[in-house]
C-alpha cells in the first residue's frame, strides 16, 4: 500500500528574467527513492537518478541548475515558462508518487525591480 504523500510549493509566481526553485518533499513512507523526474506538461526537464546523477534535457540545459537536493532551479524565466510542473518520484517498493506545482511568470516592473534576480 502506498502511504507516502508529496508536499510541493503549490502555486508560485516569479518575475520574468528571475529564478525559481521547484521543490517537492516525499514523506510518510519508508520507501527508497530511486529517481526523480521533473516534467513541464509533457516535456522532460531533468532526471535525478540515485546512481547516475543528473541528466538535464538539452532544451533546458542553459537555464536549469540541479538542486537544492532533489529540487530544480529554473533560471532566466520567460512568460512561456508559465504552467504546470510535475515532480515524479520513483520509489521502491511503493511505486510512483507525483507532485504538481503551478508556476506563473509575471512581467517584471523595471521601476520597482531594477536588479536581476539571483538564484535563492
Amino acid at each position: 500500500m502506498m502511504t507516502g504523500t508529496i508536499e510541493t510549493t503549490g502555486n508560485i509566481s516569479a518575475e520574468k528574467g528571475g529564478s525559481i526553485i521547484l521543490q517537492c518533499h516525499l514523506s510518510s513512507t519508508t520507501a527508497q527513492v530511486t529517481q526523480v523526474n521533473w516534467e513541464q506538461q509533457d516535456q522532460l526537464l531533468a532526471i535525478c537518478n540515485a546512481d547516475l546523477g543528473w541528466h538535464i534535457s538539452p532544451s533546458f540545459k542553459d537555464r536549469v541548475a540541479p538542486g537544492p537536493g532533489l529540487g530544480l532551479t529554473l533560471q532566466s524565466l520567460t512568460v512561456n515558462d508559465t504552467g504546470e510542473y510535475f515532480c515524479i518520484y520513483h520509489t521502491y517498493p511503493d511505486g510512483t508518487y507525483t507532485g504538481r506545482i503551478f508556476l506563473e511568470v509575471l512581467e517584471s516592473s523595471v521601476a520597482e525591480h531594477g536588479a536581476r534576480f539571483q538564484i535563492p
Epitope: 508536499e7 526553485i21 521543490q23 518533499h25 514523506s27 527513492v33 540515485a50 546512481d51 547516475l52 546523477g53 543528473w54 541528466h55 538535464i56 540545459k61 542553459d62 536549469v64 541548475a65 540541479p66 538542486g67 537544492p68 537536493g69 532533489l70 532551479t73 538564484i119 535563492p120
Partner: antibody, heavy 117, light 107 residues
Framework: QAYLQQSGAELVRSGASVKVSCKAS????????MHWVKQTPGQGLEWIGY????????NYNQKFKGKATLTADTSSSTAYMQISSLTSEDSAVYFC??????????WGQGTTLTVSS | DIVMTQSQKFMSTSVGDRVSVTCKAS??????VAWYQQKPGQSPKVLIY???HRYSGVPDRITGSGSGTDFTLTISNVQSEDLADYFC?????????FGGGTKLEIK
Amino acid sequence: QAYLQQSGAELVRSGASVKVSCKASGYTFTSFNMHWVKQTPGQGLEWIGYFFPGNGATNYNQKFKGKATLTADTSSSTAYMQISSLTSEDSAVYFCAREGWLSLGYWGQGTTLTVSS
Amino acid sequence: DIVMTQSQKFMSTSVGDRVSVTCKASQNVYTNVAWYQQKPGQSPKVLIYSASHRYSGVPDRITGSGSGTDFTLTISNVQSEDLADYFCQQHNRYPYTFGGGTKLEIK
C-alpha cells in the same frame, strides 16, 4: 567507485590568489554537482558553493561571492576553486565533495591553505 | 540562511553504551538532513542521508531519525572506532549549512 584527488598543501602570501584542484575519477563527471567546503577550527564546516560540470551552473554562498570562483575542465574531469585577495581568514582546510544521493557522498582528502603575511 | 544547531559540543560515553547526538534546524527542512562522521586528520564521511537512511556500508548500530526541525543521530553499542566529530547538514535550501559538530569522546 568515485574518487576525488585534491592538490597539495599551499603556503601563499597575503593578497595573492591560489587555485586548488580536485581530480575526479570513477564516475561520470558531468552528472554530479561538485561542492566545495571550508573547514576551520573556529567556524567548523562552511559550504562555499557548487559547480555543475554538466552545464556550468554555479551557486555560491553569499559569504564567498567575490572570494571564491568555481570552475571545471570536463576534458580532464577536474574541478577548480580559485580564492583571491588572500588574508589570514582564508587559512583553512578546503574540501571538494561530490553530491551524491541527498548527501555529499564522496570527499577529497582536503587541501590545507596557509596564508602568510 | 538556515542555522543548524548542535547544542552538545562534546559527549562522553563508554564502549557498549548508546549515545544520541541532536541537531536542530532554524526552520523546516523536512527530511533533507545528512549526518557525517569525521575522524582526526580525515575527510568527513556520510553516515545518514534523508534524515534516516543509512549510507552504504554504514553499520546498522548507527541510525538517524527526525523531520522538520529536530534530528537525532543514535549510535548503539558504541565502539572505540566511533571516536570522532559528528556533523549534521541540511540540503533543503542554499546555502547548504552544517551544524557546529559534536565531538564524541570514549571514557
